[in-house]
């Protein structure tokens, strides 16, 4: 099209996580998806200076079609600020990521004590469960509901019936997955909810219970307000 346009970000969700704490020897990928007309170019800076291939052993890869910078097998000297500069003749935009290369021993995910917490609400109400996860490696997080099938919580093998309600995916940010919202609660929503976090070392999970109470009856509301009676 002939509509000239300065560069702009096309997927800010993929750029929300600015601080990347990555274990040594792992691969790091920074993305700055952008658009513009004419199509902008992208370059990368490390600590405010031009980032050259010879600045790191093994160099790095730039995938222009994915607007990404990839560094394999990171080492402590890779720590620092990485800035993508996206520009065309009508303007320039930039975004900075901070990379920390972690050398401590990676461990199972740690879930904050007391979370998620037991909750109760009335039918029609809203509730949220929160799960705070600490992990050296990027954890995969799931919210699971223990469900019943044919009136039973357990299958013929003695294992519980489970339903994955929410899982971290490509389009899910860390903040989004840490909270499970249940809107317009029904009696069927009552039960056990589990926040599960796993990484390459292992899996950890905490559970909480949702209690659903009946909403105040319609008759009670009317008798409590005689003004409304004809």
């Amino acid at each position: 099209s002939n509509n000239k346009r300065a560069p702009y970000w096309t997927n800010t969700e993929k750029m929300e996580k600015r601080l990347h704490a990555v274990p040594a020897a792992n691969t790091v990928k920074f993305r700055c998806p952008a658009g513009g007309n004419p199509m902008p170019t992208m370059r990368w800076l490390k600590n405010g200076k031009e980032f050259k291939q010879e600045h790191r052993i093994g160099g790095y890869k730039v995938r222009n079609q994915h607007w990404s910078l990839i560094m394999e097998s990171v080492v402590p000297s890779d720590k620092g600020n990485y800035t993508c500069v996206v520009e065309n003749e009508y303007g320039s935009i930039n975004h900075t990521y901070h990379l920390d290369v972690v050398e401590r021993s990676p461990h199972r995910p740690i879930l904050q004590a007391g979370l998620p917490a037991n909750a109760s609400t009335v039918v029609g109400g809203d509730v949220e469960f929160v799960c705070k996860v600490y992990s050296d490696a990027q954890p995969h997080i799931q919210w699971i509901k223990h469900v019943e099938k044919n009136g039973s919580k357990y299958g013929p093998d003695g294992l519980p019936y489970l339903k994955v309600l929410k899982a971290a995916g490509v389009n899910t940010t860390d903040k989004e997955i840490e909270v499970l919202y249940i809107r317009n609660v029904t009696f069927e929503d009552a039960g056990e909810y589990t926040c599960l976090a796993g990484n390459s070392i292992g899996i950890s999970f905490h559970s909480a219970w949702l209690t659903v109470l009946p909403a105040p009856g319609r008759e009670k509301e009317i008798t409590a307000s005689p003004d409304y009676l004809e």
Partner: antibody
Framework: EVQLLESGGGVVQPGRSLRLSCAAS????????MHWVRQAPGKGLEWVAV????????YYADSVKGRFTISRDNSKNTLSLQMNSLRVEDTAIYYC?????????????????WGQGTMVTVSS | DIVMTQTPLSLSVTPGQPASISCRSS???????????VYWYLQKPGQPPQLLIY???NRFSGVPDRFSGSGSGTDFTLKISRVEAEDVGVYYC?????????FGGGTKVEIK
């Protein structure tokens, strides 16, 4: 049946390279972290490396860091260990071990299934 | 790194008698999720290790109930209530809480 089958072992001179493979079957390979563990002749067990289910995270024992590289091909259900700059002390049986899965587990979350092992001898 | 120290080095047991193996970790293996991540394995001659006990005291499927695991955050015990001929081999404890995963030095059990 859940199975892990290692291959690629052999006799090699110090300083040379060797690539081990582990073929997985009977489970959803792409949903599990995978480990390599080794055992020198007549000795105990030593953990070598782990790779996450999608290959994005890798960790190594200090004794092999910078020399060994763990990788996986989920489309082929295969785990690999590229061993460079081999030393006499790397002589061992190398076991492929299933690690933690991605979902809720009812039993152990990994280290339950081991392969039969493949022997690597580093000798001049 | 977490150091796993196993005792005794070897054990000679009469069939039908009990046996006990100890393992101590240099740091607590009690995780924030309330589980204690110590595993026990038996390695029979010429075979890979086989899982006996996971998360301190849970028997793996197919493991006879004569095997039991117990302990606290740093001190763990594997007990065999009545040793049988098929129980011979080397027993290892392992910590599964952080990398590098580490194993005890092993306890060789033989029949008198």
């Amino acid at each position: 049946e859940v199975q892990l089958l290692e291959s690629g072992g052999g006799v090699v001179q110090p300083g040379r390279s060797l690539r081990l493979s582990c073929a997985a079957s009977g489970f959803t390979f792409s949903s599990y972290a995978m480990h390599w563990v080794r055992q020198a002749p007549g000795k105990g067990l030593e953990w070598v490396a782990v790779i996450s289910y999608d290959g994005s995270n890798k960790y190594y024992a200090d004794s092999v860091k910078g020399r060994f590289t763990i990788s996986r091909d989920n489309s082929k259900n295969t785990l690999s260990l590229q061993m460079n700059s081999l030393r006499v002390e790397d002589t061992a049986i190398y076991y492929c071990v299933r690690g933690a899965g991605r979902g809720y587990t009812y039993g152990p979350d990994g280290f339950d299934i081991w392969g039969q092992g493949t022997m690597v001898t580093v000798s001049s | 790194d977490i150091v796993m120290t196993q005792t005794p080095l070897s054990l000679s047991v009469t069939p039908g008698q009990p046996a006990s193996i100890s393992c101590r970790s240099s740091r607590s293996l009690l995780h924030s999720d309330g589980k204690t991540y110590v595993y026990w394995y038996l390695q029979k001659p010429g075979q890979p290790p086989q899982l006996l006990i996971y998360e301190l005291s849970n028997r793996f499927s197919g493991v006879p109930d004569r095997f039991s695991g117990s302990g606290s955050g740093t001190d763990f015990t594997l007990k065999i209530s009545r040793v049988e001929a098929e129980d011979v081999g080397v027993y290892y404890c392992m910590q599964y809480i952080e990398a590098p995963l580490t194993f005890g030095g092993g306890t060789k059990v033989e029949i008198k």
